[in-house]
Interface confidence: medium
């Protein structure tokens, strides 16, 4: 799996979605973890509803929701009000019975320009790059990494 | 006119502490997200602590370098930002300012850690 | 970390000629919205920092406009078209796209 580089503005949600095959997970529930480390486990952050006829339910743990379009195959986390310990590495997974299958690994990147923070004044200035409107819009860019660029920075 | 003052940097012994107090005026405090930058002698500046405002549960950020050992703090009624320093090592010498990292920058105060 | 390296680390001008400066980040400063986090500042012999350009490119407030800041993703330029006496010190290239904030080590301008 390559790893999609999802980022988010601090302190505004961040939407990931993680698309599947919809009918080769037919029937499964699905779960967002955070991985511990490169070689550590990935610890479960929320999973969708018990009853997988109702994955369309939102379900939260904390900041962080879950839903799952099992239809269209799309499962869709939002972490709201994205904070800098936010940052690192994820997995979206299928499960079945006591294995999971990982759908999407994911980097969640938390950027924090001070200018995202003040109000319009002598510096910020609306409509340079986006209408005072818009500063509070949900964004995010997602991107695969690069090959060659490490996920996990070597440990010294 | 805006003002950022920094006061309590002294020559202090490894293992000791410190505290810095940044007093500011001019600006609407309280809604301003605030910063300690180091700099070190003929050395680039280096982001120390951060913190936000009230609004924002005055959460804290903190270089891994200071995490554990440093503490940044505010009291909006007195406009004013701190940094407690504990266990400092030689390393920690340096101008510290105050500053909101983007117009707004004290003078500095010098913290010199030394046996 | 976000590493910044500048080139060079030290430049002489002659008053009245422009110089360029370069910074490049080890990771991309483009965020969201198409904006470029990348920030410069000059320092005055015994002064604190001064911001002249943020975002890659917008002068700071009462910032002469001899200066300018250009780049792309991982590579930036700030150019000073015609140096002044007063243009004499250290500029340094900043990111504030992610945690820990990080400056690059600096690029010192002297006049010939």
């Known amino acids: 799996h390559n790893t999609t580089v999802f980022q988010g503005v601090e302190g505004q949600s961040l939407q990931v979605s993680c698309p599947y095959d919809s009918m080769k997970h037919w029937g499964r529930r699905k779960a967002w973890c955070r991985q511990l480390g490169e070689k550590g486990p990935c610890q479960r952050v929320v999973s969708t509803h018990n009853l997988w006829l109702l994955s369309f339910l939102r379900r939260r743990n904390g900041s962080t929701a879950i839903t799952d379009d099992t239809l269209g195959g799309t499962l869709t986390i939002t972490l709201r009000n994205l904070q800098p310990h936010d940052a690192g590495f994820y997995q979206c997974q299928s499960l079945h019975g006591s294995e999971a299958d990982t759908l999407r690994k994911v980097l969640v990147e938390v950027l924090a320009d001070p200018l995202d923070h003040r109000d319009a004044g002598d510096l910020w200035v609306p409509g340079e790059s986006e209408s005072f409107e818009d500063a509070h819009v949900e964004h995010s860019i997602s991107r695969s990494l690069l090959e060659g660029e490490i996920p996990f920075p070597p440990t010294s | 006119e805006v003002q950022l003052v920094e006061t309590g940097g002294s020559l202090v012994q490894p293992g000791k502490s410190l505290r810095l107090t940044c007093a500011t005026s001019?600006?609407?405090?309280?809604?301003?997200?605030l910063h300690w930058v180091r700099q070190s002698p003929e050395k680039h500046p280096e982001w120390v602590a951060h913190?936000?405002?009230?609004?924002?549960?005055?959460?804290?950020y903190y270089a891994e370098s200071v995490k554990g050992r440093f503490t940044i703090s505010r009291d909006d009624s007195k406009s004013s930002v701190f940094l407690q320093m504990n266990s400092l090592k030689e390393e920690d010498t340096a101008i510290y300012y105050c500053?909101?990292?983007?117009?707004?920058w004290g003078q500095g105060t010098l913290v010199t850690v030394s046996s | 970390d976000t590493v910044l390296t500048q080139a060079p680390l030290s430049l002489s001008v002659t008053p009245g000629e422009s110089a360029s400066i370069s910074c490049r980040s080890s990771?991309?400063?483009?965020?969201?919205?198409?904006?470029?986090?990348l920030y410069w500042y000059l320092q005055k012999p015994g002064k604190s920092p001064q911001l002249l350009i943020y975002?890659?490119?917008n002068l700071a407030s009462g910032v002469p406009d001899r200066f300018s800041g250009s780049g792309s993703e991982t590579d930036f330029t700030l150019k000073i078209s015609e140096v002044e006496t007063e243009d004499v010190g250290v500029y340094y290239c900043?990111?504030?796209?992610?945690?820990?904030?990080?400056f690059g080590p600096g690029t010192k301008l002297e006049l010939k």
């Open positions: 500053t909101d990292i983007l117009e707004y």
């Open positions: 001019g600006f609407p405090f309280s809604n301003v997200w």
């Open positions: 913190i936000k405002a009230k609004s924002d549960n005055y959460a804290t």
């Open positions: 990771k991309s400063l483009l965020g969201v919205r198409d904006i470029t986090s």
């Open positions: 975002r890659m490119s």
């Open positions: 900043a990111q504030f796209l992610r945690y820990p904030y990080t």
